[in-house]
Amino acid sequence: FEIALPRESNITVLIKLGTPTLLAKPCYIVISKRHITMLSIKSGERIVFTFSCQSPENHFVIEIQKNIDCMSGPCPFGEVQLQPSTSLLPTLNRTFIWDVKAHKSIGLELQFSIPRLRQIGPGESCPDGVTHSISGRIDATVVRIGTFCSNGTVSRIKMQEGVKMALHLPWFHPRNVSGFSIANRSSIKRLCIIESVFEGEGSATLMSANYPEGFPEDELMTWQFVVPAHLRASVSFLNFNLSNCERKEERVEYYIPGSTTNPEVFKLEDKQPGNMAGNFNLSLQGCDQDAQSPGILRLQFQVLVQHPQNESNKIYVVDLSNERAMSLTIEPRPVKQSRKFVPGCFVCLESRTCSSNLTLTSGSKHKISFLCDDLTRLWMNVEKTISCTDHRYCQRKSYSLQVPSDILHLPVELHDFSWKLLVPKDRLSLVLVPAQKLQQHTHEKPCNTSFSYLVASAIPSQDLYFGSFCPGGSIKQIQVKQNISVTLRTFAPSFQQEASRQGLTVSFIPYFKEEGVFTVTPDTKSKVYLRTPNWDRGLPSLTSVSWNISVPRDQVACLTFFKERSGVVCQTGRAFMIIQEQRTRAEEIFSLDEDVLPKPSFHHHSFWVNISNCSPTSGKQLDLLFSVTLTPRTVDLT
């Protein structure tokens, strides 16, 4: 190989060992039989050399640095050449470095031809191995603006006082042009300006200077986004840290065309603007840091540009001003991550503050809109607390557990609406009365409606799930001893059409000791399946539940248990079941931890089934499933 550098070219070539490899055979640069591992060639020198091995690219890298002095004379502006040409260099991983020094008052602009640049974060690499590392200067301090790959949105970077641009090319890469030009500009009065151009939908991730280290103290950095007017942009902060400020406040400022409040100032912890039409600027302003404990300011953010959806121009009013103790969250439904670009899906408050989740609270009227290609990617979860603190005031009081129509009119599917029903301990209990009788969901007879009610204890220490219930069954009411949560969960978009079938009334009633009582009025047409609460986990220790089963005068009920033995093994106490005729009070008692379960039995009058648990040994829980079937009486037994 021969490298000859013209005099006055201000170019230095350095060949040195790259990252050490585990290759056993070393490799040397050989110059007239001398072996070296580092070779420096300066302007005006001509050197002939070889390598002592077959694959020097596995060992060595080459750096070509050109110093451009704009202090003492005119600057060589325009397209930057690769000098010496890549064809004259050994095939090593090579880095071309341009170090431009200029006065503080001079602005320097790097212009990148297509493909534009895409910034990468620490630990990331470029698919083709071509990287652009750009740094600036504040007095004598070097500031890293960022590392970039090809195929992005960054078209121009403006700096002042100097710029260092390093273009890294892998040894096998055929590129023979720098891909950028340098222009002079007036002073930009800040650290740098990065211009990011979107031609269509897409996203860009960008970082503050020196990221992930700290942004220089009291500096200003601006990103200019060029977005076609027909598209919408949203900003989200992926990662940020705040330093300890002594004076001034760290902030981001937006210049948004058409805004009457330019610049719009946000704290880094605020929700950032979304649904912006056309071009906008974002600036990061540092502060004077505490000398003793400065901390670090850093920011990594994403700009997402996409087509406005039909929904994005519609404003929805969610009036929660008459509600109390209620919160509504619109959030992404869980989904497998896709590797290809997925347009963002945002919900916007007042059309400007957009984020992937939004929580609205009671007491106010909220205006929301959506910036989302597919609203099925979102769902709603609502929580409302109905509590009674004074038992004298609440007793016999009723509340309708109904999803408000404002919520049903939103274009987003309701997932859960949870009512937390709280009563004073040992003073009151609750009764749930559905508008339509309920069916308990079982494997034998699953619910196939578009929604269900999930009823569970709301006492933190108690793990008690009564079950899942849907309209169209035989359960007329459910009484529960203490605090519960009732969750209306939807399973299909058709819930909107079936919403009229929902309706549950809760009333506060005098306290009773049993954990739950189910009132069942079977229909003649079908078999009713019932199961103990906490199915699969077992009825909690020392818990008692009852079923009040009505039998019409002209019918006979067949009670059938679905296994021979309960399977429970008691550690302490006894588990038992009482089947009691309501008219005669005649009762049968079964020891569930000893006896076999009763064979199918026939009941001509309404009856009770009461199941009470012991403290079972782990793994030997109490789970019972039974059915009630009505058939017409054939003989009058009265």
């Epitope: 110059i31 039989k33 001398r34 070296i36 580092m38």
Partner: antibody
Framework: EVQLQESGGGLVQPGGSLKLSCAAS????????MSWVRQTPEKRLEWVAY????????YYPDTVKGRFTISRDNAKNTLYLQMSSLKSEDTAMYYC?????????WGQGTLVTVSS | NIVLTQSPASLAVSLGQRATISCRAS??????????MHWYQQKPGQPPKLLIF???NLESGVPARFSGSGSRTDFTLTIDPVEADDAATYYC?????????FGGGTNLEII
């Protein structure tokens, strides 16, 4: 482990010839440049010859040029030094050395005495 | 020919102290960003052993007590602290120009 073992030294009359051998093991011999270095009875070290890894390039100081020839057989992992027209000032301990970024590995040496 | 002059010719240093050996070249041994100067240690009955290559680089397996410095014509080998095992003759060698040459050696004695 890198090992270099010289042989072929001995007593020779002035004007005589001698061929030294250096058997190499523990490394890929064909990848390395080799040299001969000698140490006089006064303990002065002198570089004598250089050969590139493929054997295509050889270099000598003026003191031995035309009289000494360095060669190698990469198939046999052996380095040679053919010495002729020997002089009394060639009396020395002859070392073969592997040249990396300096003479990184040396053999134990073979003694050549030129005397009548 | 480049002549290498080592000084002192012999040196006695107490255990644990610093030993400094100098090597002066009759002309510069620097080129292409490198100083082509190497240092060797030789004990009686043994071949020389490479300690420092290209003026300041420690050969692998050599204790960090050994260090090299210098450029152009003036070079130094420093041993700090000296250990009993360091008693030997030390040579400098240049290969910037043909013929490659060695210094006359410095004999280090530990007292």
């Amino acid at each position: 482990e890198v090992q270099l073992q010289e042989s072929g030294g001995g007593l020779v009359q002035p004007g005589g010839s001698l061929k030294l051998s250096c058997a190499a093991s523990g490394f890929t011999f064909s990848s390395y440049t080799m040299s001969w270095v000698r140490q006089t009875p006064e303990k002065r070290l002198e570089w004598v010859a250089y050969i590139s890894n493929g054997g295509g390039s050889t270099y000598y100081p003026d003191t031995v040029k035309g009289r000494f020839t360095i060669s190698r057989d990469n198939a046999k992992n052996t380095l040679y030094l053919q010495m002729s027209s020997l002089k009394s000032e060639d009396t020395a301990m002859y070392y073969c050395a592997r040249y990396d970024l300096g003479f990184a590995y040396w053999g134990q040496g073979t003694l050549v005495t030129v005397s009548s | 020919n480049i002549v290498l002059t080592q000084s002192p010719a012999s040196l006695a240093v107490s255990l644990g102290q610093r030993a400094t050996i100098s090597c002066r070249a009759s002309e510069s041994v620097d080129s292409y960003g490198n100083s082509f100067m190497h240092w060797y240690q030789q004990k009686p009955g043994q071949p020389p052993k490479l300690l420092i290559f290209l003026a300041s680089n420690l050969e692998s397996g050599v204790p960090a007590r050994f260090s090299g410095s210098g450029s152009r014509t003036d070079f130094t080998l420093t041993i700090d602290p000296v250990e009993a095992d360091d008693a030997a003759t030390y040579y400098c060698q240049q290969n910037n120009e043909d013929p490659w040459t060695f210094g006359g050696g410095t004999n280090l004695e530990i007292i």
